[in-house]
Each structure stands twice: as C-alpha cells, then as structure tokens.
Interface confidence: low
C-alpha cells in the first residue's frame, strides 16, 4: 500500500492543500485513496511512513510576522483531527519572494478509514512547479 | 533492496552530483548499483522510496538571483529524463556563505534498468563534510 | 520494528536531544526501545530507515557565527560513535528568533544493540511544540 500525489493550485481559501493523481504519481491499489483532492485515506489498519514536501515562496515584508508552517494532520473515524508533524520556516527577505522547502516524515499507526492531510499557514505561497510540493505514504 | 551513498566532490562542471560507496554507505545487493558515481540503477521493477539530502553553502551577493534548487530525476530505459522531486532554498545573506540543508523523498514506481540521480543548480556550493549530503533508496 | 518518539525539553546541558513516548508516538514492539530518553536501541541486525526532524528558533545576533547543525549519530556495541547524517541551517535575522526545520533520513545497517541518537549545536533553540521535533526508525 503506497501513494504519492502531486500538489494542485486551488481557488479555495482553505488552509488544506489540494492534491491530484497527475504527473509521476503513485497509487498502488484501492486500499489507499485520494479523497476530495485533499486527503489520503487508508482502508487497512497498520503502521505507515507518511511524508509531505512543501515548497513555498514568501517575503518577510509582505507576510505576517508568524513563520510559514506546514502541518501533517490525522483524522481518525470518530476522533478529532490531530497534528502528527509540523515544520516552520521564517519568511525570506528576498524580493519579490524567496523560495524555501519543508520536508515532513514519520511513522504512525493508522486505523481503518483514517485520513491524513496537509495544512499550511498560507496556501497562496505554495509552489506548484513540477516536483516542488508532494505528499505520500507507504505501509510498513 | 536498499542503497545509501555518500557525496563526493567533483572537478566536473556537470550539475549532476557525484556519489561514492564510502564511509557508512549501504548497498544491500547487486539488484541496485551505483553507476559512474552518479546514478542509482535498479534491476527489479517495483515501488521504491527514494530520498536525497543536500547541504550547501551560498551567499546572496555571490550567487545568481535564482534560488539553489536540488532535483531528484529519473531516467527510464528508452524514455526521456524526468523530474520526480525538487526543493528550493533562497541564498543566505551570511558571510562568506550560509549553510542550508534540503531533504527530498517520495515513493515512485521504477522499471528494470531505471536510474535516479540528483541535479543541483551549483555543485560548487554543495557541502561534502561527513553526513551532510547523501542519496538513497529502498524497495517497498 | 518501528519507532517514532517525540521531543522533550530538558534541563540537561548536553547536546543530545531528549525524547519521550508521548502524544502520538509509535513503539511497535520490544525489539526497539527508547533508552534513557535519548537513544533508540535495536535488538535485531538489519537495514533500517532512520529519520529525525528538528525545528529550532534562532537569531543571528544572539547565536554564534557557526550554523545550527543537527546530527544523526550511531553507537554500535564496542565501537566509537559515528555521524550518519548531518544538516545545517544558518541562523535567521528575524527577531526575537526565526524558526527553521531540518529533516534527516537515510538507510543504514544496524547491529544488535546498536543505538542511534540526535545531537544539536544548541538544544536551547529547539522547538518542542506539538509535531515540531521528532525521531524514528523502521526496519526494512
């Protein structure tokens, strides 16, 4: 069971990143699915290595003082959402914006029907060029 | 099937990073090989988690305006090269240069004879000290 | 065999980061253990994917000129410690400090009784908020 999906620009104002099965994507079988273009949902319980990479372009003057934060989040059936992993990068002083990349990854137990998704502080700053932003998992 | 190879400074002007089986490297068996010191080639088709870490030292004034970009690329037999993953970091203002690290990783299907390699915008900026820059894969 | 442990603030002045089995941690079975809150020790020989993520907050003026470095280290029975992976990030100019995240990961052969741990240049700069700093491994 493995998946690797590719970022997709979205007109939605939500902080949850959007993904697509496009380009050099992976979707090994129907035991993992991309739902609503926003979350990877697994049908089998077990340990998974889950990862995400987010490249963004921001400028200190044009952004809030708070850093750019990417969060890998879990929603299990009947449970609250919870943060599994987070990474933060302070905005660049480069003009018009400075690119930076964040990588998240870890081993987590998922229940049947659990979904994982990626939140960012400002989706408009995310880079969607080939290979820059992606999300995936593999079952151990 | 797994490999982990260590960066090697090169006098070549190519943007493709050079690697060696040295230090605490891994080469599990002959189903994965390091070819010409530049690419990991697999003999078996399947899903692989492929990763690379690149540490570099650059200065905004001494570099081009474009960010430092590391790309994980795929060459399948009889096919064009393609970018699997990329990460970008804006140059530092630290003098003489500021170190930064990039990590790339994802799950991809490889065909028999497929090779993966790492490209960077400026190989002269890459740090080759112990553990700073490495490249590997594992078959799921 | 898999583990994922969560960073813990420590009053110790050691450069070795402290970890805990708390929050959404993983400890698959007793073939991997967290010892003294500082190292993951494995009982079985084999290839492991080992990873660490460290988020830190630093300021160029308040820090030494040297970058913030995170190192993934190995201690095998009867052997000296050795560095497996390192990543470096130059300090931010943001006030009071600028957050940055480092991700390390690679495939390594471990002997029975081998331990892995994470060293940083300044543990007081590490961010311990939910999900920011973690450490883990999985046996291939």
């Amino acid at each position: 069971i493995a998946a690797h999906v590719i970022s997709e620009a979205s007109s939605k104002t939500t902080s949850v990143l959007q993904w697509a099965e496009k380009g050099y994507y992976t979707m090994s079988n129907n035991l993992v699915t991309l739902e609503n273009g926003k979350q990877l949902t697994v049908k089998r319980q077990g340990l998974y290595y889950i990862y995400a990479q987010v490249t963004f372009c921001s400028n200190r003057e044009a952004s809030s003082q708070a850093p750019f934060i990417a969060s890998l989040c879990l929603k299990s059936p009947g449970r609250f959402e919870r943060i599994l992993l987070r990474a933060a990068n302070t905005h660049s002083s480069a003009k018009p914006c400075g690119q930076q990349s964040i990588h998240l990854g870890g081993v987590f137990e998922l229940q049947p029907g659990a979904s994982v998704f990626v939140n960012v502080t400002d989706p408009s700053q995310v880079s969607h060029g080939t290979g820059f932003t992606s999300f995936g998992l593999l079952k151990l | 099937i797994a490999a982990h190879v260590i960066s090697e400074a090169s006098s070549k002007t190519t943007s493709v990073l050079q690697w060696a089986e040295k230090g605490y490297y891994t080469m599990s068996n002959n189903l994965v090989t390091l070819e010409n010191g530049k690419q990991l080639t697999v003999k078996r088709q399947g899903l692989y988690y492929i990763y690379a870490q690149v540490t570099f030292c650059s200065n905004r004034e001494a570099s081009s305006q474009a960010p430092f970009i590391a790309s994980l690329c795929l060459k399948s037999p009889g096919r064009f090269e393609r970018i699997l993953l990329r990460a970008a970091n804006t140059h530092s203002s630290a003098k003489p240069c500021g170190q930064q690290s990039i990590h790339l990783g994802g799950v991809f299907e490889l065909q028999p004879g497929a090779s993966v390699f790492v490209n960077v915008t400026d190989p002269s900026q890459v740090s080759h000290g112990t553990g700073f820059t490495s490249f590997g894969l594992l078959k799921l | 065999i898999a583990a994922h442990v969560i960073s813990e603030a420590s009053s110790k002045t050691t450069s070795v980061l402290q970890w805990a089995e708390k929050g959404y941690y993983t400890m698959s079975n007793n073939l991997v253990t967290l010892e003294n809150g500082k190292q993951l020790t494995v009982k079985r020989q084999g290839l492991y994917y080992i990873y660490a993520q460290v988020t830190f907050c630093s300021n160029r003026e308040a820090s030494s000129q040297a970058p913030f470095i995170a190192s993934l280290c190995l201690k095998s029975p009867g052997r000296f410690e050795r560095i497996l992976l390192r990543a470096a990030n130059t300090h931010s100019s943001a006030k009071p400090c600028g957050q940055q995240s480092i991700h390390l990961g690679g495939v390594f052969e471990l002997q029975p009784g081998a331990s892995v741990f994470v060293n940083v240049t300044d543990p007081s700069q590490v961010s311990h908020g939910t999900g920011f700093t973690s450490f883990g491994l999985l046996k291939l």
């Epitope: 319980q45 077990g46 340990l47 059936p77 009947g78 449970r79 609250f80 919870r82 137990e109 229940q111 | - | 708390k22 929050g23 959404y24 941690y25 993983t26 698959s28 079975n29 939910t130």
Partner: antibody, heavy 119, light 111 residues
Framework: QVQLQQSGAELVKPGASVKLSCKAS????????MFWVKQRPGQGLEWIGE????????NFNEEFKSKATLTVDKSSSTAYMQLSSLTSEDSAVYYC????????????WGPGTSVTVSS | DIVLTQSPASLAVSLGQRATISCRAS??????????MHWYQQKPGQPPKLLIK???SLESGVPARFSGSGSGTDFTLNIHPVEGEDTATYYC?????????FGGGTKLEIK
C-alpha cells in the same frame, strides 16, 4: 503533578439541571482531551463523552447526547459538564478523567462528584 | 458499540495465590502492533486507577505482581501473589473505537 479537582456533591430535584466542574492543574490543559465517566451506585463505569479543550469539539456516547453538554474555560483550565432534565437514573458519581497521550487509557481521574436526584 | 464481558463477576482468592480475571470483547480491539485494552482497579469510595495499558504495559508505579496479556478479543489480568490491599473491583476498558466502553467489573475478595 497532574491534578483534577471536582466540584462538591449536588442534591437536585427531578427535571432540573446541574453543572459540574473539573479544574485541571499540573499540565497544559489544551494538550489533552477531557473525558467524563458515570458510575451509578453499586454499578459499573460508563463513558459519557469527551471534549477537546483546544477548540471545544465534543464526541458523545449516543446514550448521553441529549443529556450532557461539555464545555471548557481555557483561561481557568476548567472543564464543565451540564446535565439537563434530571431523573433518578442520573443519580450517580461523575468523574472527569484525562486520557493518556493520544491512546485513550485514562491515567488521571478526579475524585468524582456525587449527584443525587430526589424530590 | 463494542461490548466487553468480564468473568467471573466476583472472585475470592487466598492471600499469596493467583487471581485471574478475563475480559472478552465483542470484536477485535487489536491491531498488528497494539491491543487497545486497559485495566483499572477501583476501591470503594475512590476513583478508578489505571493498572495496565495496551493489554500488557504496566502503568508507572503499579506493583509488578499485576500483569496483563491477550490480543484480539480475549484479554486477561493476573495478580500474583495476591495481597490484602488488592481487594477491589477491576474493570477492563477498550479504546478501539468510539464510544469507549468498560466491562461490567470483577469484584476481588481476599480470603
């Protein structure tokens, strides 16, 4: 150390409501769920529901959905449970309890609040 | 909802002997890695106290004479050797899916 301090015993009339409190100390209140558990005299334990103190989200045992309302006051690190339309079936000791990490074993318990419904 | 059935409902054991309490779940509460079953001790007038988490992991500060085992649907709490202070009611509880439920309890008396 972690402590959960609950409000005192209540004697209430049928049809009335009661609001129980649970003040947490010794840990970061917003980092953990708060659970509520019911125990009728001489009986077993029943899980009522849970609240996420960070955002106030709740989940309930279906049997208590129309009976209990869970709230928190983050500024005072206090969780509340209001029980409405009380009947003799609601006479019980009510415990607030904090789960262990994310895995939901209940490692810290309040001393309990006794509620007696009687006319 | 997952139903937990404890047996026996009550148990009398001589000092120094072994007490065994069983808990059966109406469906599996174990994954490949964890069993989401926990055991509590409750003495009269006191709140429950966590003894064992995840079927077999002894909670900090709990005497080693308490042990837990099992996976899937069948779980066991053992106390050996039983001491006088172990007189109490013991409950199992699962955390597999909402709502969490408890077993009906087993009352242990020391002879």
């Amino acid at each position: 150390q972690v402590q959960l301090q609950q409000s005192g015993a209540e004697l209430v009339k049928p049809g009335a409501s009661v609001k129980l409190s649970c003040k947490a100390s010794g840990y970061t209140f917003t980092r953990y769920y708060m659970f509520w558990v019911k125990q009728r005299p001489g009986q077993g334990l029943e899980w009522i529901g849970e609240i996420n103190p960070t955002n106030g989200d709740t989940n309930f045992n279906e049997e208590f959905k129309s009976k209990a309302t869970l709230t928190v006051d983050k500024s005072s690190s206090t969780a509340y449970m209001q029980l409405s339309s009380l009947t003799s079936e609601d006479s019980a000791v009510y415990y607030c309890t904090r789960p262990l990490g994310s895995r939901d074993a209940m490692d810290y318990w309040g001393p309990g609040t006794s509620v007696t419904v009687s006319s | 909802d997952i139903v937990l059935t404890q047996s026996p409902a009550s148990l009398a054991v001589s000092l120094g002997q072994r007490a065994t309490i069983s808990c059966r779940a109406s469906q599996s509460v174990s994954s490949s890695r964890y069993s989401y079953m926990h055991w509590y001790q409750q003495k009269p007038g006191q709140p429950p106290k966590l003894l064992i988490k995840y079927a077999s992991s002894l909670e900090s500060g709990v005497p080693a004479r308490f042990s837990g085992s099992g996976s899937g649907t069948d779980f066991t709490l053992n106390i050996h050797p039983v001491e006088g202070e172990d007189t109490a009611t013991y409950y199992c509880q699962h955390s597999w899916e909402l709502p969490w439920t408890f077993g009906g309890g087993t009352k242990l008396e020391i002879k």
